[in-house]
Amino acid sequence: QSSLTPLMVNGILGESVTLPLEFPAGEKVNFITWLFNETSLAFIVPHETKSPEIHVTNPKQGKRLNFTQSYSLQLSNLKMEDTGSYRAQISTKTSAKLSSYTLRILRQLRNIQVTNHSQLFQNMTCELHLTCSVEDADDNVSFRWEALGNTLSSQPNLTVSWDPRISSEQDYTCIAENAVSNLSFSVSAQKLCEDVKIQYTDTKM
């Protein structure tokens, strides 16, 4: 990747990622420097007859760093702080080639939950106020609510009226997704409204 257009690479929190390095064809490489946010990560001197010399210069990521046979960078047990700009400089006798990368770390979504604040009106219509959440949600998480294949909401919240006298059993499903995972959680309108009805009856007595 040229330094002007960094290659964007997705990594998953806790997993591994490889930043691929392409060599100049037919040229002898003198050394390779890997940088993270403009700070040296590693310095590699290839040898034709023996193993390359690898000098890891960043102790913070050092234990999680590895290099493939083609000196692509492998980073394991990814952390959020690994997000950022990576560069590889390949120096040959005649030139220096620069490859740029932007690594973003995405979380596998987990622990989807739905909270319910519903009301029962005098006419026995049940108004559902549902809120969906996942652990550590960020701006890259998309939420939506669906019922019978139709999207009823594109936000974590859903407000909907349900009348047991005219509506059949209805499930509402929250779907949370990002670029690397998706989760869903379904709730029954009938069940939620029955619970509200019990509370409503209890308070009336």
Epitope: R144, S154, Q155, E177
Partner: antibody, heavy 118, light 106 residues
Framework: QIQLVQSGSELKKPGASVKVSCKAS????????MNWVRQAPGQDLKWMGW????????RYADDFKGRFVFSLDKSVNTAYLQISSLKAEDTAVYYC???????????WGQGTTVTVSS | QIVLSQSPATLSLSPGERATMSCRAS?????MHWYQQKPGQAPRPWIY???NLASGVPARFSGSGSGTDYTLTISSLEPEDFAVYYC?????????FGGGTKVEIK
């Protein structure tokens, strides 16, 4: 039917402010996020950010932090975009667009042209 | 941010011909949306989540792709298809649009 109707064209002087409205009808306003998209003359579409119509919480793209404010009046199902300290480069068509999920904009306003000129 | 590169910038074709346009993302995305825009009009939703046609979109349109490469195809151009088509990704904030492909009459 579902529609978004935006306020009319505006001609403003540099340094002034403008408030663009987007009135929604035909659906439950608080169930769908509202996005704002800018298209400068002869240019591509640029996503400015969105507002959660249930909580009222706005989110801005980096290029639109500072002078741009998204707001709501839920009682009249209307979203607003306010731009302060207008510059000539703010001259553009501004669109509101409903998010149907996965940031797919299934309904668009007709657009509001804002012209900034001295 | 994820950069979307659309190619070609302009497609000059005649009615009845097949049109294929590409949208390449600088990073892998889960799905791509497409919009059609005609001069002086707001964009219109065209293809949702890579391959689903929006309401009212004719079956001669199709979408495909995965990862970083996505394609919109028109099997046989009709006069009303001449317009600009934009791709848009949702996987990462900010949501970004491609630069558009203009399909013009040859």
């Amino acid at each position: 039917q579902i529609q978004l109707v935006q306020s009319g064209s505006e001609l403003k002087k540099p340094g002034a402010s403008v408030k663009v409205s987007c009135k929604a009808s035909g659906y439950t306003f608080t169930n769908y996020g509202m996005n704002w998209v800018r298209q400068a003359p002869g240019q591509d579409l640029k996503w400015m950010g969105w507002i959660n119509t249930y909580s009222g919480e706005p989110r801005y793209a980096d290029d639109f932090k500072g002078r741009f404010v998204f707001s709501l009046d839920k009682s009249v199902n209307t979203a607003y975009l306010q731009i302060s300290s207008l510059k000539a480069e703010d001259t553009a068509v501004y669109y509101c667009a409903r998010d149907y999920g996965r940031w797919y904009f299934d309904v668009w306003g007709q657009g509001t042209t804002v012209t900034v000129s001295s | 941010q994820i950069v979307l590169s659309q190619s070609p910038a302009t497609l000059s074709l005649s009615p009845g011909e097949r049109a294929t346009m590409s949208c390449r993302a600088s990073s892998s995305v889960s799905h791509m949306h497409w919009y059609q825009q005609k001069p002086g009009q707001a964009p219109r939703p065209w293809i949702y989540a890579t391959s689903n046609l929006a309401s009212g979109v004719p079956a001669r349109f199709s979408g495909s792709g995965s990862g970083t490469d996505y394609t919109l195809t028109i099997s046989s151009l009709e006069p009303e298809d001449f317009a600009v088509y934009y791709c848009q990704q949702w996987s990462s904030t900010p949501r970004t649009f491609g630069g558009g492909t203009k399909v013009e009459i040859k």
